[in-house]
């Protein structure tokens, strides 16, 4: 098209996480997906200065079609601020990521004590369970409901019946996965809920119970119903 346009970000969701704490020896990928007309060019700065291949052992890769910078096998000297500068003749935009290279011993995920907490609500109410996870390695987080089948919580193999309600995915941010919302609660929602976090070292989980109470005035309505029939 002939519509000239200064550079703009095409996927800001992929850029929300500015601080990247990455274990030593891992691969880091920073993305700055952009558009513009004419198609903008992209360059990278480290701590405000031109980032050259010779600035790190093994260099780095730039995937222009993916608007990404890739550094393999990061070391402590890779720590710092990385800025993508995207420009064309009509303008320039930039975005900065901070890289911290973690050298401490990676551990299985740590879950904040007391979370998720037991909750109770009335039928039709809303409830939320919160889970705070600390993990050196990127954790995969799931919310699980312990369900019953044919009146039993366990199958013939002795394993519990489980339903995954929510799991961290491509379109789910860390913040979104830390909270489980249950809207317009029914009696069937009562039971045990588990926040499960796993990483390459192991799995940790905490559970909480949801108690569902009758909505106020419900019993009155039921006992009064014969009057309405008359």
């Amino acid at each position: 098209s002939n519509n000239k346009r200064a550079p703009y970000w095409t996927n800001t969701e992929k850029m929300e996480k500015r601080l990247h704490a990455v274990p030593a020896a891992n691969t880091v990928k920073f993305r700055c997906p952009a558009g513009g007309n004419p198609m903008p060019t992209m360059r990278w700065l480290k701590n405000g200065k031109e980032f050259k291949q010779e600035h790190r052992i093994g260099g780095y890769k730039v995937r222009n079609q993916h608007w990404s910078l890739i550094m393999e096998s990061v070391v402590p000297s890779d720590k710092g601020n990385y800025t993508c500068v995207v420009e064309n003749e009509y303008g320039s935009i930039n975005h900065t990521y901070h890289l911290d290279v973690v050298e401490r011993s990676p551990h299985r995920p740590i879950l904040q004590a007391g979370l998720p907490a037991n909750a109770s609500t009335v039928v039709g109410g809303d409830v939320e369970f919160v889970c705070k996870v600390y993990s050196d390695a990127q954790p995969h987080i799931q919310w699980i409901k312990h369900v019953e089948k044919n009146g039993s919580k366990y199958g013939p193999d002795g394993l519990p019946y489980l339903k995954v309600l929510k799991a961290a995915g491509v379109n789910t941010t860390d913040k979104e996965i830390e909270v489980l919302y249950i809207r317009n609660v029914t009696f069937e929602d009562a039971g045990e809920y588990t926040c499960l976090a796993g990483n390459s070292i192991g799995i940790s989980f905490h559970s909480a119970w949801l108690t569902v109470l009758p909505a106020p005035g419900r019993e009155k309505e039921i006992t009064a119903s014969p009057d309405y029939l008359e």
Epitope: P23, S105, P160, S204, F205
Partner: antibody, heavy 124, light 112 residues
Framework: EVQLLESGGGVVQPGRSLRLSCAAS????????MHWVRQAPGKGLEWVAV????????YYADSVKGRFTISRDNSKNTLSLQMNSLRVEDTAIYYC?????????????????WGQGTMVTVSS | DIVMTQTPLSLSVTPGQPASISCRSS???????????VYWYVQKSGQPPQLLIY???NRFSGVPDRFSGSGSRTDFTLKISRVEAEDVGVYYC?????????FGGGTKVEIK
């Protein structure tokens, strides 16, 4: 049946390279972290490296950091250990071990299944 | 790194008699989820290690009930209530809290 089968061991000179493989079967390989553990002749067990279920995270023992690289191919259910700049002290049986899974643990969350091991001898 | 110290180095037991192996960690293995991540293995001659006990006291499937694990935080014990001839091997404790995962030096169990 859940199984891990290592291969690629052999005799090699110091400073040379070797690549170990581990073929997994009987479980959903792509849902589990995987480890390498080694055992020098007549000695105890030493953890070597781990890789996350999707390959995004890798950790190494200090004794092999910078020389060994752990990797995986989930499409082929294969775990690998590329060993460069080998030293005499790397001589050991290398075991492939299943790590933590991706779901609710109904037993141990890993380190339950070990391969038979493959022998690596570094000698001049 | 977490250091796992195992005692004794070796143990000679009469069949039918009890045996006890101790393991001490340099840091607490009690995790935030309330579990204690110490594992116990036996390695029989020419074989890979076999899991006996996980998370301090849980017997792995197929493990005879004469094996039990106990302890708290930094001090752990593997007990065999009545040793049988097939129990010979080297026993290892392992911490599964953080990398590097570390093992005890091993305890060799023999039959008198």
């Amino acid at each position: 049946e859940v199984q891990l089968l290592e291969s690629g061991g052999g005799v090699v000179q110091p400073g040379r390279s070797l690549r170990l493989s581990c073929a997994a079967s009987g479980f959903t390989f792509s849902s589990y972290a995987m480890h390498w553990v080694r055992q020098a002749p007549g000695k105890g067990l030493e953890w070597v490296a781990v890789i996350s279920y999707d390959g995004s995270n890798k950790y190494y023992a200090d004794s092999v950091k910078g020389r060994f690289t752990i990797s995986r191919d989930n499409s082929k259910n294969t775990l690998s250990l590329q060993m460069n700049s080998l030293r005499v002290e790397d001589t050991a049986i290398y075991y492939c071990v299943r790590g933590a899974g991706h779901g609710f643990p109904t037993g141990p969350d890993g380190f339950d299944i070990w391969g038979q091991g493959t022998m690596v001898t570094v000698s001049s | 790194d977490i250091v796992m110290t195992q005692t004794p180095l070796s143990l000679s037991v009469t069949p039918g008699q009890p045996a006890s192996i101790s393991c001490r960690s340099s840091r607490s293995l009690l995790h935030s989820d309330g579990k204690t991540y110490v594992y116990w293995y036996v390695q029989k001659s020419g074989q890979p290690p076999q899991l006996l006990i996980y998370e301090l006291s849980n017997r792995f499937s197929g493990v005879p009930d004469r094996f039990s694990g106990s302890g708290s935080r930094t001090d752990f014990t593997l007990k065999i209530s009545r040793v049988e001839a097939e129990d010979v091997g080297v026993y290892y404790c392992m911490q599964y809290v953080e990398a590097p995962l570390t093992f005890g030096g091993g305890t060799k169990v023999e039959i008198k």
